[in-house]
């Protein structure tokens, strides 16, 4: 199919810095021990929300908000001695750009949270 | 500079699902709340390993490994009637590919661990 | 124009230093990563280190780990090569290169290639 008119060419000298990247992924199927087992058991339980971008590849990426602002101690109640607090990590994703071309990306990072784990507050002490 | 034969092409026919992805990465400087404060602090603590490959983009990514079978109660020792389980994420990063070619990359997943979180054990009863 | 000029090659005497620099014009360095390679008079070129474009992390072939040190200044469009313990067989015409990305151990991976700079070490 013909190039989308304002799409960017590889050869484009306005457009230096392009790679061809083949989205045929490798370890398609990486065995992911989904945390989805864990999200409940936790003593800092998170619910998991769907982020989606149908320009952004991948276009479906869960995101991590922790339940309670304390820990959920042996007997189920919420503890505020302790926090629950997201564990974050960058990660890349293609981003389409111009957003009408077919296949021309953007490199772009994007924080996500993962899951929450229970922490010890630091106690600031007034003078 | 001329193509390297056997290099890809965007007009490739065999190479369907090449795209090109623009460098000039956005967000580059994410405000990453870097867990390296609550590795430390989690009742779930953990160690963060550098796995480091020079041909990947991006080239180090950290691995969070769980400290303790068990996890850290308000004491600090180890309680094992809970156990630290690693938050697993699946990530995308780039390889060259063809590994001579200048700019042709494919993306490929990795599942990373990114911290611990403590859960309640699954406990199987035997009849 | 593109290209990349290294600089700082020269005579020095076994055991001494030399500071090699490679700029970059006509394009920025921030999504290459850079690599040194050597080649001395009858041998074939080899790699001898690179940095990243992600986050600066650097390797090294054996014969040079511990005494080269490379480094990146992404504002002045510049890498280096700082070589310490200088030995007669460091003597070689010094090449730095851009490849987009990632370090690669294939020479075709480098977009771009400089003239060479002549490191002589010798008593």
């Known amino acids: 199919s013909p190039q989308n008119p304002g799409c960017p060419n590889a050869e484009d000298k306005n457009f230096p810095r392009t790679v061809m990247v083949n989205l045929n992924i490798r370890n398609r199927n990486t065995n992911s021990k989904r945390a989805s087992d864990y999200y409940n058991r936790s003593s800092s339980p998170w619910n998991l929300h769907r982020n989606e971008d149908p320009e952004r590849y991948p276009s479906v990426i869960w995101e991590a908000k922790c339940r309670h602002l304390g820990c959920v101690d042996a007997d189920g109640n919420v503890d505020y001695h302790m926090n629950s607090v997201p564990i974050q990590q960058e990660i890349l994703v293609l981003r389409r750009e111009p957003r009408h071309c077919t296949n021309s990306f953007r490199l772009e990072k994007m924080l996500v949270s993962v899951g929450c784990t229970c922490v010890t507050p630091i106690v600031r002490h007034v003078a | 500079s001329p193509q390297n034969p056997g290099c890809p092409n965007a007009e490739d026919k065999n190479f369907p699902r090449t795209v090109m992805v623009n460098l000039n990465i956005r967000n580059r400087n994410t405000n990453s709340k870097r867990a390296s404060d609550y590795y430390n602090r989690s009742s779930s603590p953990w160690n963060l390993h550098r796995n480091e490959d020079p041909e990947r983009y991006p080239s180090v990514i950290w691995e969070a490994k769980c400290r303790h079978l068990g996890c850290v109660d308000a004491d600090g020792n180890v309680d094992y009637h809970m156990n630290s389980v690693p938050i697993q994420q699946e990530i995308l990063v780039l390889r060259r590919e063809p590994r001579h070619c200048t700019n042709s990359f494919r993306l490929e997943k990795m599942l990373v661990s990114v911290g611990c979180t403590c859960v309640t054990p699954i406990v199987r009863h035997v009849a | 124009e593109v290209q990349l000029v290294e600089s700082g090659g020269g005579l020095v005497q076994p055991g001494e230093s030399l500071r090699l620099s490679c700029k970059a014009s006509g394009f920025s360095l921030d999504y290459y990563a850079l690599g040194w390679f050597r080649q001395a008079p009858g041998k074939e070129r080899e790699g001898i280190s690179c940095?990243?474009?992600?986050?600066?992390?650097?390797y090294y072939t054996d014969s040079v780990k511990g005494r080269f040190t490379i480094s990146r200044d992404n504002s002045k469009n510049t890498v280096y090569l700082q070589m310490n313990s200088l030995k007669t067989e460091d003597t070689a015409i010094y090449y730095c290169?851009?490849?987009?990305?990632?370090?690669?151990?294939?020479?075709?991976?480098?977009?771009?290639w400089g003239q060479g700079t002549q490191v002589t070490v010798s008593s």
């Open positions: 940095i990243t474009s992600s986050d600066a992390s650097a």
């Open positions: 290169a851009a490849a987009l990305l990632t370090c690669s151990s294939y020479y075709d991976a480098y977009t771009y």
